[in-house]
Amino acid sequence: FPQDRPFEDTCHGNPSHYYDKAVRRCCYRCPMGLFPTQQCPQRPTDCRKQCEPDYYLDEADRCTACVTCSRDDLVEKTPCAWNSSRVCECRPGMFCSTSAVNSCARCFFHSVCPAGMIVKFPGTAQKNTVCEPASPGVSPACASPENCKEPSSGTIPQAKPTPVSPATSSASTMPVRGGTRLAQEAASKLTRAPDSPSSVGRPSSDPGLSPTQPCPEGSGDCRKQCEPDYYLDEAGRCTACVSCSRDDLVEKTPCAWNSSRTCECRPGMICATSATNSCARCVPYPICAAETVTKPQDMAEKDTTFEAPPLGTQPDCNPTPENGEAPASTSPTQSLLVDSQASKTLPIPTSAPVALSSTGKPVLDAG
């Protein structure tokens, strides 16, 4: 009713609230030094301290550097927001074999299903492609557009398709759109509105550059703002986001107010020595024999997993493929098995990390 408007405008005379005509309700007035986490704050917990650009406020109210997605094999999935880190994921055509907080430490190109196998589940940014044997009566060469090639002479085991195992897939640990692990944990400490970044995955474009608001003496709810490229870590400290400026690194997730930038090795390389939110040493992928050499696909968010060939048919890793040209990257092969018994029962996902031994053959990388 119009006659009620003047009364509402004063919010019942409560000086700690103001009337927002846009939403037609009384909103809590954030104390000086604090910034609202939503358009119309309702309580002190809807206010927060302001971090620097490329920093986010973590669950311990620390300004923490957002991760960056500057590595060539990473793309930004969600931007750096006031309360959550930028999130990076492997770029289209690649999947994450080694996850990292808000990013991926290692991206591999999606595998191409070998001859006689067809794609059961296309690859994603988190999982490699899952292959299965071609149906009886269907030419294995052209059972799928991705597999329109002559079958190899080797026999293909008629077995169940093998998904990427949780141990090597980041599917169970990669952040989902709509909030990071940090942001989810922070929710218990910092109440968020339904339209806050962590609930819709659409971070506010305003990192806290709005006009200064009062923060009264003795207020215990004033939250700080970190510098740009810093994030508020779990301990409530403003911590520098890692830099992905090295030539062999790309940004996986950007720096947000409450999570670090994360870096990973650029396409064609894998991480030999990991580091917090980054990789200390990247090395080129090993190049393997034709049976398991894969080429990057132009399909976004695809990757491949297939069963190991029978014992005794394992290919060696060669210096280059048959055409003599090094591929853009290769997927690790099944020659990573160190336990022959395991090879009889356990399929090896193509996401298994590898390192080159002195003989040039890939060995299992426990790191």
Epitope: S205, K224, E227
Partner: antibody, heavy 119, light 111 residues
């Protein structure tokens, strides 16, 4: 009224340390980052670092990391800057300055403290 | 760190005339649609005084003859009509990355 009042001038020997204080009043001390900036005679400004008095969080300029320590005492609303292993090139006026939340500017400055390093 | 190159080093302008100081950053200062460039005025024996924040916003209490412009890497401070009290050193500062850095300063004098 917001005020930042710094301690008096100091003369120090090379290799020693100096601790400059900055007493704040007129605002919620714990809720604003306190920055420290120095200016050598006739030279430009150099950002040293900042501290968030609410929890002691700090950012430092890497050039000073290890030599500068920023602290804050909430009970007296006083920020401190300690610089160790002094050398002659540390002779400068040291300023404390409050950083605005929102645009990262430094809106209120102390009057400055001259630190002279001489043998 | 981000390097700020301020020019000119000194500037002699007649009273009532326009004075323009430039500041170029070694990398972009853009952040969520704003540029984290600040301008300060410093007179002898005094601490710096904030003039402009976010590249173009004039601080409260600063005369409207002061204005800031620019984005990305190139910025400028303009005094539309120089007054005697404007004789001072002027510094640009970036807050886009830690460590925060300042330009070398521009001395404004009366011609």
């Amino acid at each position: 009224e917001v005020q930042l009042v710094q301690s008096g001038a100091e003369v120090k020997k090379p290799g020693s340390s100096v601790k400059v204080s900055c007493k704040a009043s007129g605002y919620a001390f714990s809720s604003y980052w306190m920055n420290w900036v120095r200016q050598a005679p006739g030279q430009g400004l150099e950002w040293m670092g900042q501290i968030y008095p609410g929890d002691g969080d700090t950012n430092y300029n890497g050039k000073f990391q290890g030599r500068v320590t920023l602290t804050a005492d909430k009970s007296t609303s006083t920020a401190y800057m300690e610089l160790s292993s002094l050398r002659s090139e540390d002779t400068a006026v040291y300023f404390c300055a409050r950083r605005i939340n929102g645009n990262f500017a430094m809106d209120y400055w102390g009057q400055g403290t001259l630190v002279t390093v001489s043998s | 760190e981000i390097v700020l190159t301020q020019s000119p080093d000194s500037l002699a302008v007649s009273l009532g005339e326009r004075a323009t100081i430039n500041c170029r950053a070694s990398e972009s200062l853009e952040y969520y649609g704003t540029s984290l460039m600040l301008w300060y005025q410093q007179k002898p024996g005094q601490p710096p005084k904030l003039l402009i924040y976010s590249a173009s916003n004039v601080e409260s209490g600063v005369p409207d003859r002061f204005s800031g412009s620019g984005s990305g890497t190139d910025f400028s401070l303009t005094i539309s009509s120089l007054e005697p009290e404007d004789i001072a050193m002027y510094f640009c500062q970036q807050r886009r990355k830690v460590p925060s850095t300042f330009g070398g300063g521009t001395k404004v004098e009366i011609k």
